[in-house]
Every structure is written in structure tokens, then in C-alpha cells.
């Protein structure tokens, strides 16, 4: 008897997983934050520009890129010590002699306002206040971000307990 | 309790050698820059070395390069600096100090220890 | 190298006047400036950075302004707590991070 009385639990969880399903939710993974359409992960320990770059490559996302002052501000806000900063998808590329984002567009001179030089070899970071620029293998803190994707919430019959 | 406990000063003769130690507590050691700065008796400050959080990146100042190492555990907490080769000019009482994390390596020092003192003479 | 020069080397001042203490940089140094302040016997203490952000819980008396290569610290209304030498630092990114040669605030 022992097995058919498993079989039925089984049917049952399962009937249960098809009756509770919800409508498709935007979620952002555990640990990262909401901004807008964007989920952000601030990171918890140092690194040089580059391997900051890489660790979010690792966690399929990128370092943070910013589309204006507003995304700036509300970025700024979610950073509670004046004494902690991080670094950004921005960089100085000495060929096109402009700083350009890891997606390969350009700063455009409204929107951010970098303090320092820009020069080879510099990657830019922000502040609670600020924007600046730094030497690459500076080894500061960084934000990765990715797209807000489409979860199939579930219900877990866990609990229902 | 956030501090920082030098260590391992004392009297050596000139050409002598000395191991400073610096333990860090109450903060994650290894996600600041750490320096050592100098002051000799009734004189002013003196910026000595300092070391990224991950030890890839050193600087020295040009009194003391190529006697003076600067090193750091991050598992133990602690900074240090071996000074080989001292000289009547290196008498001082030596800081560790910990960087603001939020200017990269302009290096403004937010966290200092008691300071050990260091005496060369024969 | 990048030189500082503190001026006055030495001031005398009464508990509630007004201190002002200057550092001249050898060259531009943008806003890449702090201030200390050393009692005898202790270490420094970080009192400004960024040539005008004060730092947490240091006194609101005290500010710091300029940039470029002309900087003030200013204590406006000076304590007995306030006696003590203090030393401007450079900071731009390539070491070495200099400092002042200092300014003794004394009683009056």
C-alpha cells in the first residue's frame, strides 16, 4: 500500500502547483535591489575596475550603467555611507579619447559631471554626492545590474502550512 | 571597538633592522587601504608607505625606498613594516592609519593608532 | 613633489574668537585637501577632506574651503578642547601625500 499512498501525495502536490499559479511578476533576484527597471547588487568587498567588470559578467549582469542625472540620484540614494563608493561601467577609452560605457556608447557631456582626470588607464565611480574618476586598479567597491526579469511566481504548498 | 594597536618599536643601532606591526579591529581589514606615517620628536608628519586592501599596489615615499617594506595579512588583520638599514633619520613615532573608502587613493587617514616609537642610535 | 606651506607657523587666541589657518600648495591640487588636528602625545585626527567635507563628528565650528592651490581652515568660535597643533595634507593620487608643516593654536 505503501506506494500508492506516495503516488497520491505526488498528484496531490502537483495538483496543488497547477491551481496556485500567478500572473508573470517582475522580480529581481534575492539580494539585489529594485531601482526602477533595473536590479542593482552592490558589492561587499573591494576589487580593481576590471575585476569588478568580470564578477558581474559572472553573475550574468554588468557593472551599473547610468542613462541620466535622475538614475544618478536615485543610484546615490541607496548609498547610506558618505564614506563608501563604487565603481561604475564607465571608463576612458584612449583611442576615442572620451569615456565611454561598457555598452560601447558614449558619455554625452549633460550627463554625469566626473571629477578628475580624464586621461588612460581612468574608470569612474560614485559617491553618496559625487562622480569621480580614478586609476583602474584602484580596488573599490561596485555595482552590477541587470534587467528586471519575467518570474512565474508559485505558491509553495510549504506555505499553506 | 574600531582601533588600530601598533607594535614591535624600540631602540636598534643604525644599519639595524626592525619589524613594526599594526592589528586592525572592529572593521573589515581588507577592504581599505593602509598606510604608515611617520613624525620625529617635535617635528611634523611624514607620509611613510602605503598598501591597496588586496597588497597588489604599494607605494614609498623616496626617504624610504628600498629599506623599507610595507606587507599586510588581511586573514590576521594586520599591517606591517620591515625597516632594514635604519638610519639617526628614521627616529620617529610611526602610525598605522586606515583611508577613507570613498576617495580611491587620495588617501585621507580617518582611523589612527597610538603610534609605537622607533629610536636609531648607537 | 608637491610642496605645502601653513601660515601662521604659531597663533595665539582666546576660547570664542575666530581662527583662521591657510596652506598654500607648490602647485594645483583641485579639492584633494585635509586638515588634522594633533594634541600632544596623540595621533592626528581627521577633521576636513575634500577640502570642505566635514568629517563625522567633528564639531560644526570647524570648516574648511578653497581649491586649486589656496585652502582655509576656519574654526569659528574656538574651545578650550580646540588648543592643539593643526596640519594641512595633500591628497592627488600619485604619492607622496605631503603635509603642512603645521600651525600651533595656543592660549591667548
Known amino acids: 500500500q505503501k506506494p500508492s499512498i506516495g503516488k497520491c501525495s505526488v498528484d496531490i502536490q502537483q495538483n496543488r502547483t497547477k491551481t496556485t499559479e500567478r500572473p508573470d511578476l517582475l522580480n529581481c533576484p534575492i539580494y539585489w535591489q529594485q531601482v526602477q527597471e533595473k536590479c542593482l547588487l552592490f558589492s561587499h568587498t573591494v576589487n580593481p575596475w576590471n575585476n569588478s567588470l568580470a564578477d558581474c559578467s559572472t553573475k550574468e549582469s554588468s557593472l551599473l550603467l547610468i542613462q541620466d542625472k535622475d538614475e544618478l540620484t536615485r543610484t546615490q540614494n541607496l548609498i547610506h555611507d558618505k564614506a563608501i563608493s563604487f565603481w561604475i561601467g564607465l571608463n576612458f577609452s584612449l583611442s576615442e579619447k572620451n569615456w565611454k560605457w561598457i555598452n560601447g556608447s558614449f558619455l554625452s557631456s549633460n550627463d554625469l559631471k566626473i571629477t578628475g582626470d580624464a586621461k588612460e588607464n581612468s574608470c569612474v565611480y560614485i559617491s553618496q554626492t559625487s562622480v569621480y574618476s580614478e586609476y583602474c586598479s584602484t580596488e573599490m567597491k561596485w555595482i552590477c545590474q541587470k534587467e528586471l526579469t519575467l518570474v512565474r511566481n508559485k505558491v509553495s504548498p510549504d506555505s499553506w502550512l | 571597538q574600531v582601533q588600530l594597536v601598533e607594535s614591535g618599536g624600540g631602540l636598534v643601532k643604525p644599519g639595524g633592522s626592525l619589524r613594526l606591526s599594526c592589528a586592525a579591529s572592529g572593521f573589515t581589514f581588507s577592504d581599505y587601504y593602509m598606510s604608515w606615517i611617520r613624525q620625529a620628536p617635535g617635528k611634523g608628519l611624514e607620509w611613510v608607505s602605503y598598501?591597496?586592501?588586496?597588497?597588489?599596489?604599494?607605494y614609498y615615499a623616496d626617504s624610504v625606498k628600498g629599506r623599507f617594506t610595507i606587507s599586510r595579512d588581511n586573514a590576521k588583520n594586520s599591517l606591517y613594516l620591515q625597516m632594514n638599514s635604519l638610519r639617526a633619520e628614521d627616529t620617529a613615532v610611526y602610525y598605522c592609519a586606515r583611508s577613507l573608502m570613498s576617495t580611491g587613493t587620495h588617501l585621507y587617514f580617518d582611523l589612527w593608532g597610538r603610534g609605537t616609537l622607533v629610536t636609531v642610535s648607537s | 613633489d608637491i610642496q605645502l606651506t601653513q601660515s601662521p607657523s604659531s597663533v595665539s587666541a582666546s576660547v570664542g574668537d575666530r581662527v583662521t589657518i591657510t596652506c598654500r600648495a607648490s602647485?594645483?591640487?583641485?579639492?584633494?585637501l585635509a586638515w588634522y588636528q594633533q594634541k600632544p602625545g596623540k595621533a592626528p585626527k581627521l577633521l576636513i577632506y575634500a577640502a570642505s567635507s566635514l568629517q563625522s563628528g567633528v564639531p560644526s565650528r570647524f570648516s574648511g574651503s578653497g581649491s586649486g592651490t589656496d585652502f582655509t581652515l576656519t574654526i569659528s568660535s574656538l574651545q578650550p578642547e580646540d588648543f592643539a597643533t593643526y596640519y594641512c595634507q595633500q591628497v592627488t593620487s600619485v604619492p607622496p601625500y605631503t603635509f603642512g608643516g603645521g600651525t600651533k593654536v595656543e592660549i591667548k
Open positions: 598598501i591597496s586592501p588586496s597588497g597588489a599596489t604599494i
Open positions: 602647485q594645483g591640487i583641485s579639492s584633494w
